[in-house]
Amino acid sequence: DSGISPRAVWQFRKMIKCVIPGSDPFLEYNNYGCYCGLGGSGTPVDELDKCCQTHDNCYDQAKKLDSCKFLLDNPYTHTYSYSCSGSAITCSSKNKECEAFICNCDRNAAICFSKAPYNKAHKNLDTKKYCQS
């Protein structure tokens, strides 16, 4: 998607690697379940998928903030400041309201990912079939 800033997506990727050091976020968490990846529908297939649904919902809330006016309505176009120490993520207090909100969405999702089991059977699901309302 041309509206997505590679730097912003990279931040989320690095945040996930902070809490799950051996992971390859784009490979493992893209097109997983019903919500990890572009869009989302139906009931999440597991806890990890639910993390992604919550992340999507968090971005939807961010879009409602007056301070969040995104290019192409996409939160990934906003970059933020954060630090990673060990496996602890801290969103910088220097972030403005919008950046702080998105940083927190990403931070919570990364932590959620780290606590959720990964089921290989849920990777590249047929969403038409398994992600129904």
Partner: antibody
Framework: EVKLQESGPELVKPGASVKISCKVS????????MNWVKQRPGKGLEWIGR????????NYNGKFKGKATLTADKSSSTAYMQLSSLTSEDSAVYFC?????????WGQGTLVTVSA | EIVLTQSPAITSASLGQRVTISCSAT?????VHWYQQKSGTSPKPWIY???RLASGVPARFSGSGSGTSYSLTISTMEAEDAAIYYC?????????FGAGTKLELK
């Protein structure tokens, strides 16, 4: 409007088989999972299994493997469940239910009575 | 397989009383759904994805919970709420129901 119309009541003898049907209307039959749920008189709900008419994929509750056989006919938008080697334990109301993770649409139920 | 245990099995409540029905899973589940069934009729979807009310369900109903513990609450009991309530969940791709809680009007 989504409708699931089940076949009428059945009185069958022990050891026999029965095939009940669920004809749907109001949606694309091939695109949604069809489940079957059992309810014995005065008892709770038991999930038997489900079929995806689009490709014939089936998930069974292990308890009903060998007892229930699920099929679907896309041309008539009808789902079927065959129950074999019937005993008094199989006397129940059987519901066809559309859904995957939860069940928004239910049929009216088919009463199957197993009696000599 | 996930086993869902509902409690109590039977309960009675007076008009206007607050009622809570519990559903406990043997292992953590992402979501629990609830159905209402009255005598001689098919179950009706009542609450889905923990707390979302199905179409036509009165606002006095609510759902909550996480992990292995979930509940359905009626803020003020009404006569029409007397029914059997079932919780349901799934562990991809298999489903299970609780045994049901019969709610009677006292």
């Amino acid at each position: 409007e989504v409708k699931l119309q089940e076949s009428g009541p059945e009185l069958v003898k022990p050891g026999a088989s029965v095939k009940i049907s669920c004809k749907v209307s109001g949606y694309a039959f091939s695109s949604f999972w069809m489940n079957w749920v059992k309810q014995r008189p005065g008892k709770g709900l038991e999930w038997i299994g489900r079929i995806y008419p689009g490709d014939g994929d089936i998930n069974y509750n292990g308890k009903f493997k060998g007892k229930a056989t699920l099929t679907a006919d896309k041309s008539s938008s009808t789902a079927y469940m065959q129950l074999s080697s019937l005993t008094s334990e199989d006397s129940a109301v059987y519901f066809c239910v559309r859904g995957w993770a939860w069940f928004p649409y239910w049929g009216q139920g088919t009463l199957v009575t197993v009696s000599a | 397989e996930i086993v869902l245990t509902q409690s109590p099995a039977i309960t009675s409540a007076s008009l206007g009383q607050r009622v809570t029905i519990s559903c406990s899973a043997t292992s953590s589940v992402s979501y629990v759904h609830w159905y209402q069934q009255k005598s001689g009729t098919s179950p009706k979807p009542w609450i889905y994805e923990i707390s979302r009310l199905a179409s036509g369900v009165p606002a006095r109903f609510s759902g909550s919970g996480s992990g292995t513990s979930y509940s359905l609450t009626i803020s003020t009991m009404e006569a029409e709420d007397a029914a059997i309530y079932y919780c349901q969940s799934w562990n991809f791709p298999l489903l299970s129901f609780g045994a049901g809680t019969k709610l009677e009007l006292k």
